[in-house]
């Protein structure tokens, strides 16, 4: 009787819709690569399902990966990174859904942070800054920033700005005087990797000073 | 369907240089790594180089390394292979290989390079 | 970096069965997967294994890939054999980035 219900299950699992997704990361512990995939539909029983990595891989054949909650994870060194590997869905040792994917063309950088801004008063501008752990890496160096900034008041009123340096500079005069303004930043490669935004940053919060009625400047903080 | 075709080969001296090419057409070309691989007369297959989809990863076989640069224009859907220095034993038909869904799936016809004097 | 060994030669008559070795050096047979190339002569390799045990599609189920841990070595198995299948034969792994050759073999159908 088990055999049968076994084979239910598995005849059940065959008409479910295993499409899944996945984002690499490089270098994101020292030399470490992560991979971490996902199933697209939040309500796939994941109670037996794997997920397995073959091809392209240094000094094994294939990977398992580790299930924490709905996603599915590796942290290891040995990504080949040249070539297409082969990530399976797996019941036991029947494959549901494979995909072949260069793990270098799903990069998802990690998301910048320390990012500020500074009111320059002589300049009547706002620098803005922030990091990204990339510029130290080997292999994911050149992104493209997405810096976004808002009126706090205007909930998705964003205004964006594409750079690939980790510096911005807001003209005073292009923002609102004496408002709370919201800014935060993500990236995504740009040079040789290819992939998907990284998360935002934590937002950085700055008010713009008064208008300085004689003058017609704005007031410093 | 898929093709590759090398050119560029040709007698040179020891000592010379040369470049090899290969046309690849039929399929998308910056989505695949691309190899160089040899074969002296009468021998056996030689691997020599590869070069990722983006031309960001190159690796050589240590017989060729310093001597030997693969590169890419995806843009023109070209592969290269410039090899210096070249000696009697480099000698070969020279053969760009694709790596799809997994090495060598296709193969051009191969390009002569004869290293004389 | 290690080395792939085959024999130089095997043969085999019209409808029997040959089996092509392929010895490595050093390091597991288990850590890479291992292609299979023929070659006719004059003509360019075409792949008819890849992954220890698949066939490209195009490529008879006559032939067959094998990898047997004891030995450290990988296997290609032709069954039924046809005169068209007289050529030189390729192992290939890699090492990381580095792919590696075996000899070859040269199979004669009698």
């Known amino acids: 009787e088990s055999g049968y219900a076994q084979n239910g299950d598995l005849e059940d699992a065959e008409l479910d819709d295993y499409s899944f997704s996945c984002y690499s990361q490089l270098e994101v512990n020292g030399s470490q690569h992560s991979l971490t995939c996902a199933f697209e539909d939040p309500d796939v029983n994941i109670t037996n399902l794997e997920f397995e990595i073959c091809g392209a891989l240094v000094e094994v054949k294939c990977l398992n990966f580790r299930k924490l909650q709905e996603i599915y994870f590796i942290e290891t060194k040995k990504f080949l990174l040249i070539g297409k590997s082969n990530i399976c869905v797996k019941v036991g040792e029947k494959s549901l859904t494979c995909k072949k994917i260069d793990l270098t063309t799903i990069v998802k950088p990690e998301a910048p942070f320390d990012l500020s801004v500074v009111y320059r008063e002589g300049a009547n501008d706002f620098v803005v800054t922030f990091n990204t752990s990339h510029l130290q890496k080997k292999y994911v160096k050149v992104l493209m920033h997405d810096v976004a900034y808002r009126q706090e008041k205007d909930e998705n009123k964003w205004t964006h700005v594409n750079l690939s340096s980790t510096k911005l500079t807001l003209l005073q005069r292009k923002l609102q005087p004496a408002a709370m303004y919201e800014i935060k930043v993500r990236s995504i490669p740009d040079h040789y990797f290819k992939g998907f935004w990284s998360e935002w940053s934590p937002s950085y919060y700055f008010r713009t000073p008064e208008i300085n009625n004689s003058s017609g400047e704005m007031d410093p903080i | 369907q898929v093709n590759l075709r090398e050119s560029g080969g040709g007698l040179v001296k020891p000592g010379g240089s040369l470049r090899l090419s290969c046309a690849a057409s039929g399929f998308t070309f910056d989505d695949s790594v691309m190899h160089w691989v040899r074969q002296a007369p009468g021998k056996g297959l030689e691997w020599l180089s590869l070069?990722?989809?983006?031309?960001?990863?190159?690796y050589y076989a240590d017989s060729v390394k310093g001597r030997f640069t693969i590169s890419r224009d995806n843009t023109k859907n070209l592969l290269y292979l410039q090899m210096n220095s070249l000696r009697a034993e480099d000698t070969a038909v020279y053969y760009c290989?694709?790596?799809?869904?997994?090495?060598?799936?296709?193969w051009g016809q191969g390009t002569l390079v004869t290293v004389s004097s | 970096n290690f080395m792939l060994t085959q024999p130089h030669s095997v043969s085999g008559s019209p409808g029997k069965t040959v089996t092509i070795s392929c010895t490595r050096s050093s390091g597991s047979i288990d850590s890479s997967y291992v292609q299979w190339y023929q070659q006719r002569p004059g003509n360019s390799p075409t792949t008819v294994i890849y992954e220890d045990d698949q066939r490209p599609s195009g490529v008879p189920d006559r032939f067959s890939g094998s990898i047997d841990s004891s030995s450290n070595s990988a296997s290609l198995t032709i069954s039924g054999l046809v005169t068209e299948d007289e050529a030189d034969y390729y192992c290939q792994s890699y090492d990381f980035h580095h792919l590696v050759f075996g000899g070859g073999t040269k199979l004669t159908v009698l």
């Open positions: 290989a694709r790596q799809g869904d997994y090495m060598g799936d296709y």
């Open positions: 070069v990722g989809w983006d031309g960001f990863f190159t």
